[in-house]
């Protein structure tokens, strides 16, 4: 699966938050990043990502939600030159300072779900999504289609504004 | 479920020390400032003691100001009150309370049950 | 350090009754204001803040309003569990200050 392209076709900021409206949350410790699942207070600062938003070449065969071969996929970068990153090995996601281009665990195929929702497939690792565990982030196989309503993988984005750099 | 436990409360002589603790439990305990607030019997209630999420700073009003220090440790999610050179007009209920996020959102969501602290001879 | 004044100090009141505490504070806050429920045994909870928030779970009968220097808190119809003392609290500036209660008790 190749990026069409080394620039984004759109990037916006937005609050992500998961399918029972706890936020995801971005805290600096020790010069590294911690993500967090938490119960934010409507009067709490909602911490934001930017969504960098590719257009992606892909077999037939592939899952996702594109058209004609094509389908989008995603960076997530709560703070500049830090992105979300599949580790496939640990089963979980890690927040990395990296350098353009960026590597592939990077990057999260897009599904858009029912009800505004939407999950994100890592492009390492086809079948294996972005989703809650215990309070974390965490990489969650996904055995079926039927099961990618699975509330655990599904995510709402709160757009708050169209965005050009950091 | 947030909870806050609050303890450490006991009977002591002017002008001895006491220390108060309170172990927090179901959110990020250091996204979090945290508050001591004291309620005298009978009477209403008084914000003594803030520190900031990392613990970096902390805030105190002039009646416990060099007397009173708060501190925490966030590898045990716990809150503490050293309290030095105690008064009879010390003599309280103690609860600890879960301030703003980071600088944002409105104070003290969530209160420990309180822990009593009586300054006699 | 900024005045909260409480009105009435204590409120008798009957089950089914509408209530309303009010709160004046010495300067404007900007809406940065909460509202604490205190049991007899001491256990306090958040039912309201920015002023007309209410805190999830806590029961539609109670409402916050005002601006400025005025805020209220009402209840729209007591229920028995509703009998305590209320708190204001004003979070606009240091030191951040409570008013002096209002205790609501039974007729």
């Known amino acids: 699966m190749s990026i069409t392209g080394i620039s984004p076709i759109t990037e916006y900021l937005a609050s992500l938050s998961t399918y029972n409206d706890q936020s995801i949350t971005f805290a600096l410790e020790d010069e590294s990043y911690e993500i967090y699942v938490e119960d934010l207070k409507k009067d709490e600062k909602k911490d934001k990502v930017l969504l960098s938003y590719y257009e992606s070449q892909h077999p037939s065969n592939e899952s996702g939600d594109g058209v004609d071969g094509k389908m989008l996929m995603v960076t997530l970068s709560p703070t500049k030159d830090f992105w979300l990153h599949a580790n496939n090995k640990e089963h979980s996601v890690e927040l990395h300072k990296s350098e353009k281009p960026l590597p592939d665990q990077a990057f999260f195929v897009l599904h858009n779900m029912h009800s505004n929702s939407v999950s994100f497939e890592s492009k390492t690792d086809p079948g294996v999504f972005i989703g809650v565990k215990d309070n974390h982030l965490a990489l969650i196989k996904v055995d079926s289609s039927e099961n990618l309503s699975t509330e655990n993988i599904l995510f709402k984005l709160s757009e708050t504004h169209h965005h050009h750099h950091h | 479920e947030v909870q806050l436990v609050d303890s450490g409360g006991d009977q002591v002589q002017p002008g001895r020390s006491l220390k108060l603790s309170c172990v927090a439990s179901?959110?990020?305990?250091?996204?979090?400032?945290m508050t001591w607030i004291r309620q005298v019997p009978g009477k209403g209630l008084e914000w003594i003691a803030s520190?900031?999420?990392?613990?970096?700073?902390?805030y105190y009003p002039d009646s416990v100001k060099g007397r009173f220090t708060i501190s925490r440790d966030n590898a045990k999610d716990t809150l503490y009150l050293q309290m030095n050179s105690l008064r009879s007009e010390d003599t309280a209920t103690y609860y600890c309370?879960?301030?703003?996020?980071?600088?944002?959102?409105?104070?003290?969501?969530?209160w420990g049950q309180g822990t009593l602290v009586t300054v006699s001879s | 350090d900024i005045q909260l004044t409480q009105s009435p100090s204590t409120l008798p009141a009957s089950l089914g009754e509408r209530v309303t505490i009010s709160c004046r504070t010495s300067?404007?806050?900007?809406?940065?204001l909460c509202w604490y429920q205190q049991k007899p045994d001491g256990t306090v909870k958040r039912l309201i803040y920015?002023?007309?928030t209410l805190e999830s779970g806590v029961p539609s009968r109670f409402s916050g309003s005002g601006s400025g220097t005025d805020y209220s808190l009402s209840i729209s119809s007591l229920e028995s569990q509703d009998f305590a003392m209320y708190y204001c609290?004003?979070?606009?500036?240091?030191?951040?200050?409570f008013g002096g209660g209002t205790k609501l008790e039974l007729k």
């Open positions: 520190i900031t999420n990392s613990g970096g700073n902390t």
């Open positions: 300067q404007s806050i900007n809406n940065n």
């Open positions: 179901g959110f990020i305990f250091k996204n979090y400032w």
């Open positions: 920015s002023t007309s």
């Open positions: 309370a879960r301030d703003r996020r980071y600088n944002s959102g409105s104070p003290f969501a969530y």
């Open positions: 609290l004003q979070y606009a500036t240091y030191p951040w200050t």
